[in-house]
């Protein structure tokens, strides 16, 4: 398994991740957003809600 060198993003990247933590993937030369629960997207800009459907009458 290849090891990935990571560090915190530079101050220049403040505000890059809307709802998550910015980490710098050094060997890949890119910033990456680790999203908070409920958020997705490259910059954690999309909110998604997991809806639990009630059981249908047919199933009951």
């Amino acid at each position: 398994v290849a090891q990935v060198s990571i560090t915190k993003c530079s101050s220049d990247m403040n505000g890059y991740c809307l709802h998550g933590q910015c980490i710098y993937l050094v060997d890949m030369s890119q910033n990456y957003c680790r999203c908070e629960v409920g958020y997705t997207g490259v910059r954690c800009e999309h909110f998604f809600l997991t809806v639990h459907q009630p059981l249908s009458k047919e199933y009951v």
Partner: antibody
Framework: QDQLVQSGAEVKKPGASVKVSCKAS????????IQWVRQAPGQGLEWMGR????????KYREKFEGRVTITADTSTNTAYMELSSLRSEDTAVYYC?????????WGQGTLVTVSS | DIQMTQSPSSLSASVGDRVTITCKAS??????IAWYQQKPGQAPRLLIQ???TLQPGVPSRFSGSGSGTDYTFTISSLQPEDIATYYC????????FGGGTKVEIK
């Protein structure tokens, strides 16, 4: 394949404005930040400013504040840099640069000549 | 704004020589420095980012080191194709380029 394609060369009179475009393909500019850098003939590289197309906010180098405006149109995946009150010292190649998801991916450059 | 002082502004060396360029930041830039090579008529080419991480396809004779405010770029054995101007760039807080170093063959 990711690309940043800039508009063609411009010749402007002193005091005029110029607007350079930078069209992205292969990626969404909302995932990135677009920086603008210029280089006068025989001179070094100079960072001018940047835009965050998703948030719409900008940061400018102090010396350009009030004279440069960086914008982005996310519907066409294009960023723009407008420089006003042009003077001969603004003659330079202007580059747009993608940063964020990938470290510093450059456009081909646009030569702006300011001459009376 | 962070200032980047790059030296020397130009140098002349023989093929095979070790070449060293330095950049000094006006404040701690936490290793967020990149090095570019630019040849006449071309856009700059990224060689190194985050002080010492070589980009894919960049020869191993190029290297970088440093921390805090002081950073060094080295070509271990100068080749004819290395004739170019080299720039440092800090990207810790906004962005600032060094003034450039023109490398020529003696």
């Amino acid at each position: 394949q990711d690309q940043l394609v800039q508009s063609g060369a411009e010749v402007k009179k002193p005091g005029a404005s110029v607007k350079v475009s930078c069209k992205a393909s292969g990626f969404n500019i909302k995932d990135t930040r677009i920086q603008w850098v210029r280089q006068a003939p025989g001179q070094g590289l100079e960072w001018m400013g940047r835009i965050d197309p998703l948030r719409g906010n900008t940061k400018y180098r102090e010396k350009f504040e009030g004279r440069v405006t960086i914008t982005a149109d996310t519907s066409t995946n294009t960023a723009y840099m407008e420089l006003s009150s042009l003077r001969s010292e603004d003659t330079a190649v202007y580059y747009c640069v993608r940063s964020g998801t990938l470290f510093d991916f450059w456009g081909q450059g646009t030569l702006v000549t300011v001459s009376s | 704004d962070i200032q980047m002082t790059q030296s020397p502004s130009s140098l002349s060396a023989s093929v095979g020589d070790r070449v060293t360029i330095t950049c000094k930041a006006s404040q701690d830039i936490h290793k967020y420095i990149a090095w570019y090579q630019q040849k006449p008529g071309q856009a700059p080419r990224l060689l190194i980012q985050y002080t010492s991480t070589l980009q894919p396809g960049v020869p191993s004779r190029f290297s970088g080191s440093g921390s805090g405010t002081d950073y060094t770029f080295t070509i271990s054995s100068l080749q004819p194709e290395d004739i170019a101007t080299y720039y440092c760039l800090q990207y810790d807080n906004l962005r600032t380029f060094g003034g450039g170093t023109k490398v020529e063959i003696k």
